[in-house]
């Protein structure tokens, strides 16, 4: 079999909300993946599991099941959303993200994603990791996942 390629494109949108009483930040992060099937037969994307880390702590997880079928020599772009919560021992971040004196509140998050594909009863997992900047002070949307350029570090295969 030929390869199935997974390319993490980047953050498509990040929507933020806050709970001042709980000193908690809620970040809904939508990411974009390109999955390319280099085979001459269809491949099933069984599931996508994703997690987001801040400062080595997992702040959000998501799983998508029975996602799509990718035809021979075809590529599909898939968006997935990870709801994240920055709270408790990281509640000090609430002060930073709502700091009145600055307009830009960048934090670095690690996006981890694993794609499970299946063909002819055979399963394969492909993982990617990418560090991304997110502004935790405002909502951000990107045109056509332009955030491909946001890499802090190159992906670790």
């Amino acid at each position: 079999p030929r390869s199935i390629e997974v390319k993490y494109i980047g953050v498509k949108s990040a929507y933020v909300s806050y709970d001042a009483e709980k000193r908690t930040i809620y970040l809904n992060i939508t990411n974009t993946l390109n999955i390319t099937n280099n085979n001459y037969y269809s491949v099933e994307v069984e599931n996508i599991t994703a997690q987001v880390q801040f400062s080595k702590t997992v702040i959000g997880k998501a799983r998508l099941n029975n996602i799509t079928n990718i035809g021979p020599l075809d590529m599909k772009q898939i968006d997935y959303t990870v709801p994240t919560v920055i709270a408790e021992e990281m509640s000090y971040m609430y002060d930073f993200c709502t700091l009145l004196s600055i307009k830009v509140h960048n934090i670095v998050l690690m996006m981890q994603v694993t794609v499970t594909t299946a063909y002819f009863g055979h399963s394969e997992q492909i993982s990617q990791e990418r560090y991304q900047y997110v502004d935790c002070g405002r909502n951000t949307t990107y045109q056509l996942a332009q955030s491909e350029y946001l890499n802090v570090l190159q992906p670790q295969q």
Epitope: A20, V104, Y133, D135, G137, T140
Partner: antibody, heavy 118, light 113 residues
Framework: EVQLQQSGPVLVKPGPSVKISCMAS????????IHWVKQSHGKSLEWIGL????????NYNQNFKGKATLTVDTSSRTAYMELNSLTSEDSAVYYC???????????WGQGTLVTVSE | DIVMTQSPSSLSVSVGEKVTVSCKSS????????????LAWYQQKPGQPPKLLIY???TRESGVPDRFTGSGSGTDFTLTISSVQAEDLAVYYC?????????FGAGTKLELK
């Protein structure tokens, strides 16, 4: 519909001070920054500063420090701006506006005309 | 403070015409972290408060017609109205949304020919 209801026009003599108000309705007052913006007649917009109702925190434009004082009364969901040492230069329309934290200013009050004249 | 320079200061247009308004900032409005430009465009009609049209340099506010397009990066930005309608006659302001104090351009007045 979201509303920021500002107090009516005021005519004041040069000298002391004037306090104008901005009452919020339909949205969670504590969840937004309230900004104040000055627009002199036929001129552009000047950002005066903002106040965070939740804790009363403020951020002023240096050009208005000492001129404007921003406060809030959360019980009445009202933001106030006091302008002191009034001169004719302070004659303008003053807008209150809101932003969801550091997001852009998305909604504005109708404006309060302040006229400083003998 | 970031200085915002708009041009032209006024523009005489006919309905259906394409219009471009330029805005230059004295410092970059690019958030080098997330690669987003923090610039907003407002429309102000006589006797009314400003209305947010575009933020993040290119994202249209909800309900804004798609004839309004924002573009540009760093220090050079453009607001384009693809086909001007009578209701578009107003003053347009660009605004630095990158750092305090927030600063506005002097405005571009759109008038009917």
């Amino acid at each position: 519909e979201v509303q920021l209801q500002q107090s009516g026009p005021v005519l004041v003599k040069p000298g002391p001070s004037v306090k104008i108000s901005c009452m919020a309705s339909v949205f969670t007052f504590n969840d937004y920054y309230i900004h104040w913006v000055k627009q002199s007649h036929g001129k552009s917009l000047e950002w005066i500063g903002l106040v965070y109702p939740y804790n009363g925190g403020t951020n002023y434009n240096q050009n208005f420090k000492g001129k404007a004082t921003l406060t809030v009364d959360t019980s009445s969901r009202t933001a106030y701006m006091e302008l002191n040492s009034l001169t004719s230069e302070d004659s303008a329309v003053y807008y209150c506006a809101r932003s969801y934290f550091s997001n852009p200013i998305g909604y504005w009050g109708q404006g309060t005309l302040v006229t400083v004249s003998e | 403070d970031i200085v915002m320079t708009q041009s032209p200061s006024s523009l005489s247009v006919s309905v259906g015409e394409k219009v471009t308004v330029s805005c230059k900032s004295s410092q970059s409005l690019l958030n080098s972290g997330n690669q987003k430009n923090y610039l907003a465009w407002y429309q102000q009609k006589p006797g009314q408060p400003p209305k947010l049209l575009i933020y993040g340099a290119s994202t249209r506010e909800s309900g804004v017609p798609d004839r309004f397009t924002g573009s540009g990066s760093g220090t050079d930005f453009t607001l384009t109205i693809s086909s001007v309608q009578a209701e578009d006659l107003a003053v347009y302001y660009c605004q630095n949304d990158h750092s305090y104090p927030l600063t506005f351009g002097a405005g571009t007045k759109l008038e009917l020919k």
